[in-house]
């Protein structure tokens, strides 16, 4: 069920549960396994890191990608690997850490219209987009032509963050992906962990803005792993 999903996408400087109540026991929702958004339920605490087997990048955390652990290794055995930092070699965008993308085989810094991260993958589920007329019924197939003219504003349906205006990212919300504000300094963020399933992440926050990273709030270091509050902080 999704009872344990932490509904934390209200872009406000509020600790759970004030940021949302889906994480409360008795939250009135349930779902079939894999419903709507795959891959959000495979987190584990950083303190107890073990390689996590995967089939695709979406199954890994924001700071990871899915690949064979050894160069030229068995393609059938893939695990979540740490993302590659700027100027490191890459073969696809997902290999590069948030804020970067793969260009000519090297991870380079994203410009404002090319954010990436777990929430940036082209959505393969059956959800359309309505970024221009916003009537809810523009087709996905019209995306490329329309998006060159109009960038989605906050609340617009999107497929990827490049569909959204500057300062916004494309993040999941229920059965949709919509443009949400990129997080500012001090705002609560989601630090992705893999195991110890907390249900499907259907309430995504954006990533932290430029020059910020999602880190444990200093006064929460003593708290238990599960209750640590992460906020966007200066590098």
């Amino acid at each position: 069920t999704l009872n344990s999903v932490l509904n934390s996408n209200a872009i406000k400087n509020l600790p759970p549960p004030l940021g949302g109540a889906a994480g409360h026991p008795g939250s009135a929702v349930s779902a079939a396994p894999g419903i709507l958004y795959p891959g959000g339920n495979k987190y584990q605490t950083i303190d107890n890191y073990q390689p996590y087997p995967c089939a695709e990048d979406e199954e890994c955390g924001t700071d990871e990608y899915c690949a064979s652990p050894t160069r030229g290794g068995d393609a059938g055995v893939q695990i979540c690997l740490a993302c590659r930092k700027r100027r490191k070699r890459c073969m696809r965008h997902a290999m590069c850490c948030p804020g970067n993308y793969c260009k000519n085989g090297i991870c380079v810094s994203s410009d404002q219209n090319h954010f990436r991260g777990e929430i940036e993958e082209t959505i393969t589920e059956s959800f359309g987009n309505d970024h221009s007329t916003l009537d809810g019924y523009s087709r996905r197939t019209t995306l490329s032509s329309k998006m060159y003219h109009t960038k989605g504003q906050e609340g617009s349906v999107c497929l990827r963050s490049s569909d959204c205006a500057s300062g916004l990212c494309c993040a999941r919300h229920f059965w949709s992906k919509i443009c949400k504000p990129v997080l500012k300094e001090g705002q609560v963020c989601t630090k992705h962990r893999r195991k110890g399933s907390h249900g499907l992440e259907i309430f995504q926050r954006c990533y932290c803005g430029e020059g910020l990273s999602c880190r444990i709030q200093k006064d929460h270091h003593q708290a238990s792993n599960s209750s640590r509050l992460h906020t966007c902080q200066r590098h």
Epitope: A10, I11, K12, S126, G155, W175, S176
Partner: antibody, heavy 117, light 107 residues
Framework: EVQLLQSAAEVKRPGESLRISCKTS????????MHWVRQMPGKELEWMGV????????SYNQKFKGHVTISADKSSSTAYLQWSSLKASDAAMYYC??????????WGQGTLVTVSS | EIVMTQSPPTLSLSPGERVTLSCRAS??????LNWYQQKPGQAPRLLIY???RLHSGIPARFSGSGSGTDFTLTISSLQPEDFAVYYC?????????FGQGTKLEIK
């Protein structure tokens, strides 16, 4: 133009089974999620659940889980809401709604279900 | 689940008047609020989504505002066709929930 055409009103007895339908046209059925919403006489709207017609995945409001089943047939671009055993309290107007965003943009005209012994 | 409370339950006004309908959420829902209009014997119709975005085909006299827990739907100048029941809906937390509605009737 998006159109959602729901099946006709039904009069049933408690304990009977029922399946109501929502036939869609004007868009690609598998590209949008389909929701069912209940409205009891003189009451507010209640979200029952959602289906992704492309793969049959469903998510229910806990209040309705186990009592109703949402399904979809891609070949006929039709969504269904069904009960295996109706209760008197199931008497209501039922709407289907097709959408892309976290809002309900297009609605069927509604199917009135009467349950009376 | 999040409880949505609308006020007042009924409002009697004349065409041409400005009206403000209120909706309160039991907890912070950010901007995840939609407004619908329902006329007798008809299905609801989406007016406003994401707090203030006007749905296509909806007249500009409708507008939405607010944030957090308190939201308003404003109709700048009531037209005869605007008399109906208005529902707010939160889509911040599953399950999406609706308010009990505000009935707008002709004075």
């Amino acid at each position: 133009e998006v159109q959602l055409l729901q099946s006709a009103a039904e009069v049933k007895r408690p304990g009977e089974s029922l399946r109501i339908s929502c036939k869609t046209s004007g868009y690609t059925f598998t590209e949008y999620t389909m929701h069912w919403v209940r409205q009891m006489p003189g009451k507010e709207l209640e979200w029952m659940g959602v289906i992704d017609p492309s793969n049959g995945d469903t998510s229910y409001n806990q209040k309705f889980k186990g009592h109703v089943t949402i399904s979809a047939d891609k070949s006929s671009s039709t969504a269904y809401l069904q009960w295996s055993s109706l209760k008197a309290s199931d008497a209501a107007m039922y709407y289907c709604s097709s959408t892309t965003g976290p809002w309900f943009a297009s609605w069927g005209q509604g199917t009135l279900v009467t349950v009376s012994s | 689940e999040i409880v949505m409370t609308q006020s007042p339950p009924t409002l009697s006004l004349s065409p041409g008047e400005r009206v403000t309908l209120s909706c309160r959420a039991s907890q912070d829902i950010s901007n995840y609020l939609n407004w619908y209009q329902q006329k007798p014997g008809q299905a609801p119709r989406l007016l406003i989504y994401y707090k203030s975005r006007l749905h296509s085909g909806i007249p500009a006299r409708f507008s939405g505002s607010g944030s957090g827990t308190d939201f308003t739907l404003t109709i700048s100048s009531l037209q005869p066709e605007d008399f109906a029941v208005y529902y707010c809906q939160q889509v911040h937390t599953l399950p999406p929930t609706f308010g009990q509605g505000t009935k707008l009737e002709i004075k």
